[in-house]
Interface confidence: low
Amino acid sequence: SEIPKGKQKAQLRQREVVDLYNGMCLQGPAGVPGRDGSPGANGIPGTPGIPGRDGFKGEKGECLRESFEESWTPNYKQCSWSSLNYGIDLGKIAECTFTKMRSNSALRVLFSGSLRLKCRNACCQRWYFTFNGAECSGPLPIEAIIYLDQGSPEMNSTINIHRTSSVEGLCEGIGAGLVDVAIWVGTCSDYPKGDASTGWNSVSRIIIEELPK
């Protein structure tokens, strides 16, 4: 019959002890296991692993020489008038000549001044910027309108409010060099013009700033 595995192991251990210490007294039972020893010294370095896969492509960097901090010199100009008080309804209000340093930059323009429109019936007026005589086409004109509809022409009176307003925008696609920036007053498509006034009794200004793309 088979001997249980546990008994087999015990018999073998006894045999080994007898063989090892033949002729001597038998060894007592094994003691309690000792504590873990101190960690051994580091082994020698392993061989290098195989190269990893390529990483994802990074975002396009900037040449240091072209970076904003490195080479962009602020370029701006302000033209101002203490009291334009210009009563024209069609035509140029004011202009400011600016030297644009780069062809791939944008121009930010601002006109700030009091605007007034009055009429007895519905009317509309448009204030807009031109660059060397043409409106901005990169991407669209820079404009502001005032539409006024009294609603009661029989009153035979007109409201006369002069309010400081601004016309502002960015224009791209203008070449480097001298740029004649002007603010005009004109008509709104399909509406009659009224009695316009620009820059009454207050400071008006055009601010032009060249911005990096």
């Epitope: 035509g91 140029k92 004011a94 409106e135 004109g186």
Partner: antibody, heavy 119, light 107 residues
Framework: EVQLVESGGGLVQPGGSLRLSCAAS????????IHWVRQAPGKGLEWVGR????????NYADSVKGRFTISADTSKNTAYLQMNSLRAEDTAVYYC????????????WGQGTLVTVSS | DIQMTQSPSSLSASVGDRVTITCRAS??????VAWYQQKPGKAPKLLIY???FLYSGVPSRFSGSGSGTDFTLTISSLQPEDFATYYC?????????FGQGTKVEIK
């Protein structure tokens, strides 16, 4: 009434010079842009250049750049076109035109003055 | 520069006819197109601006349409005083450029 009247045209030899005037009335040129447009005999309209009398800034067509100069005298309410180094292909009726408040559109024109460049 | 191409270069029509002239820009000019009328020995006169708006004092038989690159001038019922040459012009950017003209003649 808005009016533009050109003068100064005539016959000139190739390489010669001529100065055209554009006298404005009914409006002040400093509140507008004044453009010059020419028309060769039997041909279409060709833009020559512009001046902003308010600040004196000018722009020119490539075909006349370096040879033609536009100026203005706001006290006389008059714009000028100085033409140097004239060529046969500059022969045309020269018009001055005003841009008022309508987006680079010529709302008033002069009657034109004929410039003939021939030997 | 933006090129403006007109067609036809000339046409013959009778009083009362409906006449259509087309103009094509070499690039998108939004609605920044004007039409002028010129009679022999005279300066051009503004008829239409911003593609479709009638300039003051111009008879309502003239009308304009279009945007982008294709534009049309229509005379709904041709009158004797309308026999002239018509030009389109882009006012989108400097330099302003004109079409080569369309001469409207009496049939």
């Amino acid at each position: 009434e808005v009016q533009l009247v050109e003068s100064g045209g005539g016959l000139v030899q190739p390489g010669g010079s001529l100065r055209l005037s554009c006298a404005a009335s009914g409006f002040t040129i400093s509140g507008s842009d004044i453009h010059w447009v020419r028309q060769a005999p039997g041909k279409g309209l060709e833009w020559v250049g512009r001046i902003s009398p308010y600040g004196g800034n000018t722009n020119y067509a490539d075909s006349v750049k370096g040879r033609f100069t536009i100026s203005a005298d706001t006290s006389k309410n008059t714009a000028y076109l100085q033409m140097n180094s004239l060529r046969a292909e500059d022969t045309a009726v020269y018009y001055c035109a005003r841009v008022g408040g309508l987006k680079l559109l010529f709302d008033y024109w002069g009657q034109g003055t004929l410039v003939t460049v021939s030997s | 520069d933006i090129q403006m191409t007109q067609s036809p270069s000339s046409l013959s029509a009778s009083v009362g006819d409906r006449v259509t002239i087309t103009c094509r820009a070499s690039q998108d000019v939004s609605t920044a197109v004007a039409w002028y009328q010129q009679k022999p020995g005279k300066a051009p006169k503004l008829l239409i601006y911003s593609a479709s708006f009638l300039y003051s004092g111009v008879p309502s038989r003239f009308s304009g349409s279009g945007s982008g690159t294709d534009f049309t001038l229509t005379i709904s019922s041709l009158q004797p005083e309308d026999f002239a040459t018509y030009y389109c012009q882009q006012s989108y950017t400097t330099p302003p450029t004109f079409g080569q003209g369309t001469k409207v003649e009496i049939k």
